[in-house]
């Protein structure tokens, strides 16, 4: 009966620009590859936090290489969100601060932050994987410097420059690199196969977490869990997605299950993920 | 097996309101895995995406804003159905109208299609 | 908008052909990609879903690939049946948006 009182609460997107969460390839170093050719590309340098020229050898590379300046600001750099670095004591909120959490239309279950204009701070949910909008954050500390107010009534920018409130000057801090990387199994996913109470047979799937496959099962025809399917297929799709990496917009991209160490070349580091 | 089985008039006059309702059998319209879609399809604009609804807990809707002043969807939970109104009709709104379930952007189920001709 | 743009627009081939169809997203999408088939008077069908996964019931000669801006349907040996118009869509962002189509028509 909750779904009855809701039925006319609609919660509705407002004109804003799309989401735009930084891409993690933006932290890639500028890489010319190994051919040859002289060819002109632009990169965001994350020391810089610019997008700037360089040559491209024509051949393989990284993802975080552009034909157009242009490109590179619209993929690399938070100025269409709003996200800017701070020159004013008192800034107002980006709009999208105000907008209701938004866990979007996929089937994910990923921890996320948005900023509750009802609280005044910063709260998690959980965010489907796809979609959604732009108040949505990875990290409580990148909601709270980006929607809340800080102890002296002025706001931090969202690369973790803070704005001095004695002398107005901006104090860099560490760059983070984002983690490539993640696992997001829907927490369904993990539950056993629930016949649930009532008296019918129907034929259902759900997802086998001990031996990692889809699986038949007889449905009662009401209750059980969200492990329940009506299609293999859709039950694949919902839980078998092994290791996820996340690459744009808070998005999520299927990576294939090797049994070798995948290497991934970043700034700062290197880091080594082992697929399961 | 998911259907949905779609309804309304064909023929609307300009300045008017067009109205379409899809019925759901084999899903819920408050499932909290699935987004219900209209799309429309005309030779001039090709597949268009007008807007969707989506229970997580709540209702959310998303519209697309080349209609997003003159476009209302709803849910109707008692009778497991959802429909389109679409305000201020012009004969550029003429078009084939379909409803669909989406489970993660994936449009994998539709409905049967409606030809709305906007015609005084 | 995120603008999908398919090439070709349309294509005449022959029974046992191999068949490949692009579309390009106007920025990046990463996987967040579905191919769609249309024949005359019908409703769309889902073929493929998140760049490469075939749709339930859907034969194996159709594949997809690619990552990004840039995408690729192949059919491997084109069938009597699969003369119909070809849509991709994105879901990285709103609107949902499709490609304006690729028509294979029979040489």
């Known amino acids: 009966d909750s779904e009855e009182d809701e039925e006319h609460t609609i919660i509705t997107d407002t004109e804003l620009p799309p989401l735009k969460l930084m891409h993690s390839f933006c932290a890639f170093k500028a890489d010319d590859g190994p051919c040859k050719a002289i060819m002109k590309r632009f990169f965001f340098n994350i020391f810089t936090r610019q997008c700037e020229e360089f040559i491209y050898g024509g051949c393989e590379g990284n993802q975080n290489r552009f034909e157009s300046l242009e490109e590179c600001k619209k993929m690399c750099t938070r100025d269409n969100a709003n996200r800017i670095i701070k020159t004013t004591l008192q800034q107002e909120k980006p709009d999208f601060c105000f907008l209701e959490e938004d866990p979007g239309i996929c089937r994910g279950y990923i921890t996320r932050y948005f900023y509750n204009n009802q609280t005044k701070q910063c709260e998690r949910f959980k965010y489907g994987g796809c979609l959604g909008n732009m108040n949505n954050f990875e990290t409580l500390e990148e909601c709270k410097n980006i929607c809340e107010d800080g102890p002296n009534g002025f706001q931090v920018d969202n690369y973790g420059t803070q704005l001095n409130a004695v002398n107005n000057s901006l104090t860099p801090q560490s760059t983070k690199v984002p983690s490539l990387f993640e696992f997001h199994g829907p927490s369904w996913c993990l539950t056993p196969a629930d016949r649930g109470l009532c008296r019918a047979n129907e034929n259902r799937f759900y997802y086998n977490s001990v031996i990692g496959k889809c699986r038949p099962f007889k449905y009662s025809g009401c209750g059980g869990n969200e492990n329940n399917f009506t299609s293999k297929q859709e039950c694949l799709r919902a839980c078998k997605k092994g290791f996820i990496q996340r690459i744009s917009k808070g998005g999520l991209i299927k990576t294939k299950r090797k049994r070798k160490k995948q290497r991934v070349k970043i700034a700062y580091e290197e880091i080594f993920v082992k697929n399961m | 097996q998911v259907q949905l089985q779609q309804s309304g008039p064909g023929l609307v006059k300009p300045s008017q309101t067009l109205s379409l309702t899809c019925a759901i059998s084999?899903?819920?319209?408050?499932?909290?895995?699935?987004?219900w879609s209209w799309i429309r399809q005309s030779p001039g604009r090709g597949l268009e995406w007008l807007g969707m609804?989506?229970?997580?807990?709540?209702?959310?809707?998303h519209y697309a804003v080349s209609v997003k002043s003159r476009i209302t969807i709803n849910p109707d939970t008692s009778k497991n159905q959802f429909s389109l109104q679409l305000n201020s009709v012009t004969p550029e709104d003429t078009a084939v109208y379909y409803c669909?379930?989406?489970?993660?952007?994936?449009?994998?189920?539709w409905g049967q299609g409606t030809l709305v001709t906007v015609s005084s | 908008d995120i603008q999908m743009t398919q090439s070709p627009s349309s294509l005449s081939a022959s029974v046992g052909d191999r068949v490949t169809i692009t579309c390009r997203a106007s920025q990046s999408i990463t996987n967040y990609l579905n191919w769609y088939q249309q024949k005359p008077g019908k409703a769309p069908k889902l073929l493929i879903y998140d760049v490469s996964n075939l749709q339930s019931g859907v034969p194996s000669r159709f594949s997809g690939s690619g990552s990004g801006t840039d995408f690729t349907l192949t059919i491997s040996s084109l069938q009597p049946e699969d003369f119909a118009v070809y849509y991709c869509?994105?879901?990285?962002?709103?609107?949902?948006?499709f490609g304006q189509g690729t028509k294979v028509e029979i040489k």
């Open positions: 084999g899903d819920s319209v408050s499932s909290s895995s699935a987004a």
């Open positions: 869509q994105q879901y990285s962002g709103y609107p949902l948006t």
């Open positions: 609804i989506y229970y997580r807990s709540k209702w959310y809707n």
């Open positions: 669909a379930r989406g489970g993660s952007g994936v449009m994998d189920v």
